[in-house]
């Protein structure tokens, strides 16, 4: 038998966040029913984490032995304190589309972990704004967004935006 | 170390022009706003200007608007300040300081460099 | 215009004793999305400003607990509740609340009596 650190030593972890209690919910991405430690994992889901704040689970399974794999589930920041926000301006919105995330509420991460994705049809940005310009006016565009915390998606957000009818005579 | 060092300033005649420069180390530079705040010899703060992290949206106050423009170089972590039609009221210590999106704080500030119009 | 303006000009204070810094604003700055975006920063001699308090009366951190912010709609106060040699300065309202037209006050120096 491995150990269970060396087979789950790629383990991967999806956050969900409950808007509800503000709390994370970290989904183990494994094939098998784990056993967590000290930690009670339902489902391979270790509920009720605090943003921001790492948490430690020891993941065991009887398919292999010990020393169990010591999992630090790096919590991001809550997704209400993010915002999708048009930042178009009026006057060039026939051929432009403005999108910025916006931290609305401090939280204690290192935003330095904090990345942003954007794709708006096949062209992908990594930032946390994005404008594009040279559109074709009265057309739909559809950006998704997502933001990640070490590499961890935890928002994402996605915009239809029309651009306005061009000026007379353009 | 989170760190921002200005530079670029000097003595300057009324009605020209200078370029001041922010080199910005330890952190995710472009994950912030960024704003330049200038301090009188009276010794007042006033904001003079401010860039989104992406370099969309930039705003400046009434004083300096057309004179004035902010820019930032993400690649190299640098933030500017093009100064133009100078004025003696424009004599200040400047300060680039980061704000963590438009609505936080300004956690973080370079030791300023002077700027002094005069004929 | 948000006009921030900040009394006392000049506070002589005794080390020990209790600083109070009044910080009055030209119209409400409490923001549309309900947070009041109203900052305090202090500037030591030779120095460049550092923050104090942010959104009224959250201490950033590293910032002693003898710092505190209170207030509300126009009118502000940053207190010290027993003043150190380490706190001597000119001390500075700020508000971030009517983006982009961010004010200071005019400082208050806080000096040795």
């Known amino acids: 038998k491995p150990t269970c650190d060396e087979k789950y030593a790629n383990i991967t972890v999806d956050y969900l966040y409950n808007k509800e209690t503000k709390l994370f919910t970290a989904k183990l991405n494994v094939n098998e029913n784990v056993g967590c430690g000290n930690n009670t994992c339902t489902n391979n889901e270790v509920h009720n984490l605090t943003e921001c704040k790492n948490a430690s689970v020891s993941i065991s399974h009887n398919s292999c032995t010990a020393p169990d794999k010591t999992l630090i589930l790096d919590v991001p920041p809550g997704v209400e304190k993010f915002q999708l926000h048009d930042c178009t301006q009026v006057e060039k919105a026939d051929t432009t589309i403005c999108l910025k995330w916006k931290n609305i509420e401090t939280f204690t991460c290192d935003t330095q972990n904090i990345t942003y994705r954007f794709q708006c049809g096949n062209m992908i940005f990594d930032n946390k704004e994005i404008k594009l310009e040279n559109l074709e006016p009265e057309h739909e565009y559809k950006c998704d967004s997502e933001i990640l915390y070490n590499n961890h998606k935890f928002t994402n957000a996605s915009k239809i935006i029309k651009t306005d009818f061009g000026s007379p005579g353009e | 170390e989170v760190q921002l060092v200005e530079s670029g300033g000097d003595l300057v005649k009324p009605g020209g022009s200078l370029k001041l420069s922010c080199a910005a180390s330890?952190?995710?530079?472009?994950?912030?706003?960024m704003s330049w705040v200038r301090q009188t010899p009276e010794k007042r703060l006033e904001w003079v200007a401010y860039i989104s992290s992406g370099g969309v949206s930039t705003y400046y106050p009434d004083t300096v608007k057309g004179r004035f423009t902010i820019s930032r170089d993400n690649a190299k972590n640098t933030l500017y300040l093009q100064m133009s039609s100078l004025k003696s009221e424009d004599t200040a210590m400047y300060y680039c300081?980061?704000?963590?999106?438009?609505?936080?704080?300004?956690?973080?500030w370079g030791a300023g460099t002077t700027v002094t119009v005069s004929s | 215009d948000v006009l921030m303006t900040q009394t006392p000009l000049s506070l002589p204070v005794s080390l020990g004793d209790q600083a109070s810094i009044s910080c009055r604003s030209s119209?409400?700055?409490?923001?549309?999305?309900?947070?009041?975006?109203l900052e305090w920063y202090l500037q030591k001699p030779g120095q460049s400003p550092k923050l104090l308090i942010y959104k009224v009366s959250n201490r950033f951190s590293g910032v002693p607990d003898r710092f505190s912010g209170s207030g509300s709609g126009t009118d502000f106060t940053l207190k010290i509740s027993r003043v150190e040699a380490e706190d001597l300065g000119v001390y500075y309202c700020?508000?971030?609340?009517?983006?982009?037209?961010?004010?200071f006050g005019g400082g208050t120096k806080l000096e040795i009596k």
């Open positions: 330890g952190f995710a530079f472009s994950n912030y706003d």
């Open positions: 119209q409400s700055i409490v923001h549309s999305n309900g947070n009041t975006y």
């Open positions: 700020f508000q971030g609340s009517h983006v982009p037209m961010y004010t």
């Open positions: 300081a980061r704000r963590y999106d438009v609505w936080w704080y300004f956690d973080v």
